[in-house]
Interface confidence: medium
């Protein structure tokens, strides 16, 4: 807590400018009007304040806005955002995507901090759903963002937002998350033709049921082994040897290298040896 002291004569700040870096902490507290600071926040980032000075500026804003900062201030916090605690952020009402982008930019290159996680949570809750633009923004900054959400949270993602998802955004998703995302993707891409549809749906197939895999096997899709290995075991087991052969096309030979790994191992054990032999890969059931 900075002690309240009178501002020395001639030092009252009437603008946020570089001269303030020479002010001691108590002078900043005494000589900078919080409302002036709030309305000239965009200038703060251009001034090389010390961490201690930023603490004083934050303290002034906290006093001015005990119920939480308005968005006009939040949008221009810049590096002062790094001084905020999740408790501070929980008081905010962030509705503008521009504000979200500005703050994510400050944290760019770092892992998702508790502050950022809280900010995103406040933003998404405020919007009611993860719309396409938001998802686009979040995955651009944090490719693993989607997979950090619970299945319950993912259920609020509208199918239209799936268009913003890139394959790498799903790299860390587990089967429960893909179970939620796959039906949305199927709905989103339903009007595309066969080959285009497969390119788009491929990343989501870890949530596909058996009947959809059977349908894909009739479309000469040539699924690669990496995708096949991510399929749900319970969805793969009912597939016949002929269906897997059609599904994988020229990639079927890759089954040999994966015969000890799930879901290939479990699928092999379910097949008749005669059927496996037709593949000519030496797979032993």
């Amino acid at each position: 807590e900075v002690e309240k002291t009178a501002c020395p004569s001639g030092k009252k700040a009437r603008e946020i400018d570089e001269s303030l870096i020479f002010y001691k902490k108590w002078e900043l507290e005494a000589c900078v009007d919080a409302a002036l600071l709030a309305t000239q926040m965009d200038r703060v980032n251009a001034i090389p304040f010390t961490y201690e000075q930023l603490d004083v500026l934050k303290h002034k804003l906290d006093e001015l806005y005990p119920q939480g900062y308005p968005e006009s201030v939040i949008q221009h916090l810049g590096y002062l955002f790094l001084k905020m605690s999740p408790e501070d952020i929980r008081k905010w009402n962030v509705t503008s995507l521009e504000t979200l982008k500005a703050l994510l930019e400050v944290n760019k290159g770092h892992e998702m901090s508790p502050q950022v996680a809280t900010l995103i949570d406040r933003f998404v809750k405020g919007r009611g759903q993860l719309d396409k633009d938001t998802l686009d923004t979040l995955t651009a900054f944090y490719p693993g963002y989607l997979c950090s959400l619970s299945p319950e949270e993912l259920s609020s993602v509208p199918p239209s937002s799936i268009w913003a998802v890139r394959p790498q955004d799903l790299d860390t998703c587990d089967p429960r998350q893909l179970d939620v995302l796959y039906p949305k993707a199927r709905l989103a891409f339903q009007n595309m033709n066969g080959s285009e549809y497969f390119v788009k749906i491929q990343s989501f197939l870890g949530g596909a049921p058996t009947e959809d895999l059977k349908a894909l096997s009739q479309q000469n899709v040539s699924m690669d082994l990496a995708t096949f290995m991510k399929l749900r075991t319970d969805a793969v087991l009912p597939l016949t040897v002929a269906e897997v052969q059609k599904l994988l096309g020229p990639h079927v030979e890759g089954l040999k290298a994966e015969e000890r790994h799930r879901p290939v191992r479990d699928w092999i054990l379910r097949q008749r040896q005669d059927d496996l032999d037709t593949l000519g890969l030496g797979l032993q059931g």
């Epitope: 570089e18 409302a35 002036l36």
Partner: antibody
Framework: EVQLQQSGAELMRPGASVKISCKAT????????IEWVKQRPGHGLEWIGE????????KYNEKFKGKATFTADTSSNTAYMQLSSLTSEDSAVYYC??????????WGQGTSVTVSS | DVLMTQTPLTLSVTIGQPASISCKSS???????????LNWLLQRPGQSPKRLIY???KLDSGVPDRFTGSGSGTDFTLKISRVEAEDLGVYYC?????????FGSGTKLEIK
């Protein structure tokens, strides 16, 4: 475009009070001081004081302490100056101006106050 | 309070000729942040004042470049290179460095 629109002329009795308004448009009202200036023929321009609408912070010229009181309403972007216990010395044109740091960059059209019995 | 002394009180100039107004302050107007808050205003007849120059020499937008401000510390000058009819009125210097802000007494520019 920055504009400051002041209330109309006032004819007041000695001892009465008057409240002058200054409505700001075209900029972020809370971000700049509103300055108040008095002009009397033969007396030039005198700075009365200022208010920062965002916080309500005020600064008064010692000469006008007890005479002028500043308020601001950020919901209507309007600043007010009340002058109390009016005498003939208070007859003047009063201007509001936007305080751009240490200079008054935009001025209202002025409000004439005449104190007469 | 800082006293601002303006000279001359009246200036009678022929159109097209130069004009110069002086403003002296009783204290230095250099502020603690390194800036000097000396401004020039023009009040045309029947109008409210309009700022021409701030921070000694910076022209406000829309102000013709025939106006120049100069000076430092306690001595300041406003020059008009070629006076035009629209320049008539009363010119004031005003300081914003020390509270209370104070104005010069004004210089009336008349056209000969």
């Amino acid at each position: 475009e920055v504009q400051l629109q002041q209330s109309g002329a006032e004819l007041m009795r000695p001892g009465a009070s008057v409240k002058i308004s200054c409505k700001a448009t075209g900029y972020t009202f809370s971000a700049y001081w509103i300055e108040w200036v008095k002009q009397r023929p033969g007396h030039g321009l005198e700075w009365i004081g200022e208010i920062l609408p965002g916080s309500g912070s005020t600064k008064y010229n010692e000469k006008f302490k007890g005479k002028a009181t500043f308020t601001a309403d950020t919901s209507s972007n309007t600043a007010y100056m009340q002058l109390s216990s009016l005498t003939s010395e208070d007859s003047a044109v009063y201007y509001c101006a936007r305080g751009d740091y240490y200079a008054m960059d935009y001025w209202g059209q002025g409000t004439s106050v005449t104190v007469s019995s | 309070d800082v006293l601002m002394t303006q000279t001359p009180l009246t200036l009678s100039v022929t159109i097209g000729q130069p004009a110069s107004i002086s403003c002296k302050s009783s204290q230095s107007l250099l502020y603690s942040n390194g800036k000097t808050y000396l401004n020039w205003l023009l009040q045309r007849p029947g109008q409210s004042p309009k700022r021409l120059i701030y921070l000694v020499s910076k022209l406000d937008s829309g102000v013709p470049d025939r106006f120049t401000g100069s000076g430092s510390g306690t001595d300041f000058t406003l020059k008009i290179s070629r006076v035009e009819a629209e320049d008539l009125g009363v010119y004031y210097c005003v300081q914003g460095t020390h509270f209370p802000f104070t104005f010069g007494s004004g210089t009336k520019l008349e056209i000969k």
